[in-house]
């Protein structure tokens, strides 16, 4: 391998296309993201440029380490596509396109409870709905902070429903639900709803 001024002396396999990636692929508007442009050849003095469509967003150089471009996704059109150009003197190669998926975060869901009380049992129906947020939304129901349902996926703006039957409890139970969509590490919870213990008219949700 010679230290040469003319990059055209390089073989194609010595200078393949760069790779453009981000740890975060699903984002919400206003989110800050980091994009990484890297190259397999760790010996070359590479100049990396980032583009969104035809707009030049920035340039960095690096050898043996990726270029890191920090961006803020504020508008829908900023989802992409992004391209990274790696240049060594007069040689340049482009990465594949990379696009973010912009997802509206879920708002705190509302939990509604309906109970049919019999002498021995309570038949409980839990409804959970988040009125805002990109679909699909996964709902999970909790009793006393323990998940009691699998994730229920809703592809429409209809409440998730979960039924359970319980022996009339002697202690009050607390229910809440979680709403989550494709935004990683972003889940919202309903206000807790407390079911009182049996006795008297202490079941405000009950249909008798």
């Amino acid at each position: 391998r010679k230290a040469v001024l003319d990059c055209e002396a390089m073989k194609t396999n010595e200078f393949p296309s760069p790779c453009l990636d981000s740890k975060t692929k699903v984002v919400m508007k206003g989110q800050n993201v980091s994009m990484f442009c890297s190259h397999k050849n760790k010996s070359l003095q590479i100049t990396y440029s980032l583009f969104r469509r035809k707009t030049h967003l920035g340039t960095q150089d690096g050898k043996g380490e990726p270029a890191i471009f920090n961006l803020s996704i504020t508008e829908a059109h900023e989802s992409g596509p992004y391209k990274c150009k790696a240049q060594v003197t007069s040689c340049s190669k482009y990465s594949r396109d990379f696009s973010f998926t912009i997802v509206d975060p879920v708002t705190s869901p509302v939990l509604n409870i309906m109970v049919i009380q019999t002498e021995t049992d309570r038949h409980i129906t839990l409804h959970c709905l988040s009125v805002n947020g990109s679909l699909p939304i996964n709902y999970t129901f909790f009793e006393n902070h323990v998940a009691i349902s699998p994730a229920i996926s809703k592809y429409d703006r209809e409440p998730a429903e979960f039924n359970l039957t319980k022996k009339n409890p002697g202690e009050e139970e607390e229910y809440r639900c979680e709403a989550k969509n494709r935004l990683p590490n972003y889940a919202t919870y309903s206000h807790p709803v407390t079911m009182p213990s049996t006795g008297g008219d202490s079941c405000p949700f009950c249909l008798k």
Epitope: C7, M10, S43, L44, T59, D61, K63, G64
Partner: antibody, heavy 117, light 111 residues
Framework: EVQLVESGGGLVQPGGSLRLSCAAS????????MIWVRQAPGKCLEWIGI???????YFANWAKGRFTISRDNSKNTVYLQMNSLRAEDTAVYYC???????????WGQGTLVTVSS | DIQMTQSPSSLSASVGDRVTITCQAS??????LSWYQQKPGKAPKLLIY???TLASGVPSRFSGSGSGTDFTLTISSLQPEDFATYYC?????????????FGQGTKVEIK
Amino acid sequence: EVQLVESGGGLVQPGGSLRLSCAASGFSLNNYFMIWVRQAPGKCLEWIGIITSYHTTYFANWAKGRFTISRDNSKNTVYLQMNSLRAEDTAVYYCAPYDIYGYPTLWGQGTLVTVSS
Amino acid sequence: DIQMTQSPSSLSASVGDRVTITCQASQSIGAYLSWYQQKPGKAPKLLIYEASTLASGVPSRFSGSGSGTDFTLTISSLQPEDFATYYCLGAYGRSSDDGTAFGQGTKVEIK
């Protein structure tokens, strides 16, 4: 023939300014990172700074504020502007492009700058 | 900021001797180090780059080793044309202010 020629050196008074040129022939400087290096008489090589292919410049701490590097791609030339010159800036000044691996391989013959009253 | 400390500053040797020059970086620079030979009144000449890769046209008696902070240039059998001053040049992987520096040089003289 591929070569670099530095020019613009000479005698200058303390406090004066000088602009050195580094012209390339036989190849285009446009896409190359260019560094400036100097060597005082009988002393070691000293890195001054670099201009990237995308026109960003970086300097040794001692050169910041007094020295600037620019490039004119249409003239295939890189410049070193030196202001507020001092006696200790007396040296031979070299330019060199980085090769594809990021090392200066091709050097000019240098241009001598003498700062004296 | 990067500083390169080269040693020894000078050495006397005879033709045929094995000569070793060391260079230490103030911070880790991976393998981003090159070695240069300079003769009086001449521009530097690249010998080694990437710490251990021999530059084009350089005799194989020259070799380089090291990574991180400690680097070595070795001349296995000193020849008459090798009497010169040798410099290391260290750099970070990304261009930055004060991100490149030469060592102080090692003058190899005839004993």
